[in-house]
């Protein structure tokens, strides 16, 4: 099966790499514009230059193209705790990230929020905090993991999953009580 190609891909595939087919004359291959520029006018004929113009401030193209307009620069989302790692240039979009000791939680493919890395109080760091993943904690004896925090087994209710983790602690308490009654 031949994969389906869109009209633009079909037109481009007729020309060698780095060129595109003239939209009004399919016998002409025009040179694509470099990154940081956009297509102002198609080449007038074979071997003639494509008219490419540099992107204006606040816009960019990150690869060779024949776009009629540059792409708008992304803005970092302050409400999601994002900070600007590098500002937008004519050939590169804004790079957004998180502060030190924070990680990204992706709500969707292109939307992330910054959260503080867990410190593993009353536990130890099993896996360090990564760019896109919180610290993985292992809790000390007498503590259980709840919402990635080590919580005292004294807060463990019978109905919760923690009963399995806190069972030895509970049994030890019972054993101590029993030995005290003899």
């Amino acid at each position: 099966l031949v994969p389906h190609l869109g009209d633009r891909e079909k037109r481009d595939s007729v020309c060698p790499q780095g060129k595109y087919i003239h939209p009004q004359n399919n016998s002409i291959c025009c040179t694509k514009c470099h990154k940081g520029t956009y297509l102002y006018n198609d080449c007038p004929g074979p071997g003639q230059d494509t008219d490419c113009r540099e992107c204006e401030s606040g816009s960019f193209t990150a690869s060779e193209n024949h776009l009629r307009h540059c792409l708008s620069c992304s803005k970092c989302r302050k409400e999601m705790g994002q900070v600007e790692i590098s500002s937008c240039t004519v050939d590169r979009d804004t790079v957004c990230g998180c502060r030190k000791n924070q990680y990204r939680h992706y709500w969707s493919e292109n939307l992330f929020q910054c959260f503080n890395c867990s410190l593993c109080l009353n536990g130890t760091v099993h896996l360090s905090c990564q760019e896109k993943q919180n610290t993985v904690c292992t809790c000390h004896a007498g503590f259980f993991l709840r919402e990635n925090e080590c919580v005292s087994c004294s807060n463990c209710k019978k109905s919760l999953e923690c009963t399995k983790l806190c069972l030895p602690q509970i049994e030890n308490v019972k054993g101590t009580e029993d030995s005290g009654t003899t």
Epitope: H105, W107, S108, E109, N110, L111, E147
Partner: nanobody, 120 residues
Framework: EVQLLESGGGLVQPGGSLRLSCAAS????????MGWVRQAPGKGLEWVSM????????YYADSVKGRFTISRDNSKNTLYLQMNSLRAEDTAVYYC?????????????WGQGTLVTVSS
């Protein structure tokens, strides 16, 4: 077919509380983050809150931080929004929304909405 059915809206006095619910069906609830969006009269849509599947990550708009609490019950396929210390500016239609995993649009399905009116 994805269905999101909101309930719990109504008229409440400033300083009062309401709890909105959203019953979800037609998709695997435990695979998607969920959220609440609102639209005040004559205004655009505003994200209110979001929650991931296990409830470990939440987002709140600055305008509702400390007053609203989002939660979910995965066993009941239900999303909640507890709204306390309500203000006149919280008057809006509140929509339950399923968060898309792809693309730049956060939400891909919405409910019909429930009207919250804060007035004395």
């Amino acid at each position: 077919e994805v269905q999101l059915l909101e309930s719990g809206g109504g008229l409440v006095q400033p300083g009062g509380s309401l709890r909105l619910s959203c019953a979800a069906s037609g998709f695997t609830f435990t695979r998607y983050s969920m959220g609440w969006v609102r639209q005040a009269p004559g205004k655009g849509l505003e994200w209110v809150s979001m929650i991931d599947v296990p409830g470990l990550h939440t987002y709140y708009a600055d305008s509702v931080k400390g007053r609203f609490t989002i939660s979910r019950d995965n066993s009941k396929n239900t999303l909640y929004l507890q709204m306390n210390s309500l203000r006149a500016e919280d008057t809006a239609v509140y929509y339950c929304a399923k968060i898309s995993q792809f693309g730049s649009n956060a939400f891909d399905y919405w409910g019909q909405g429930t009207l919250v009116t804060v007035s004395s």
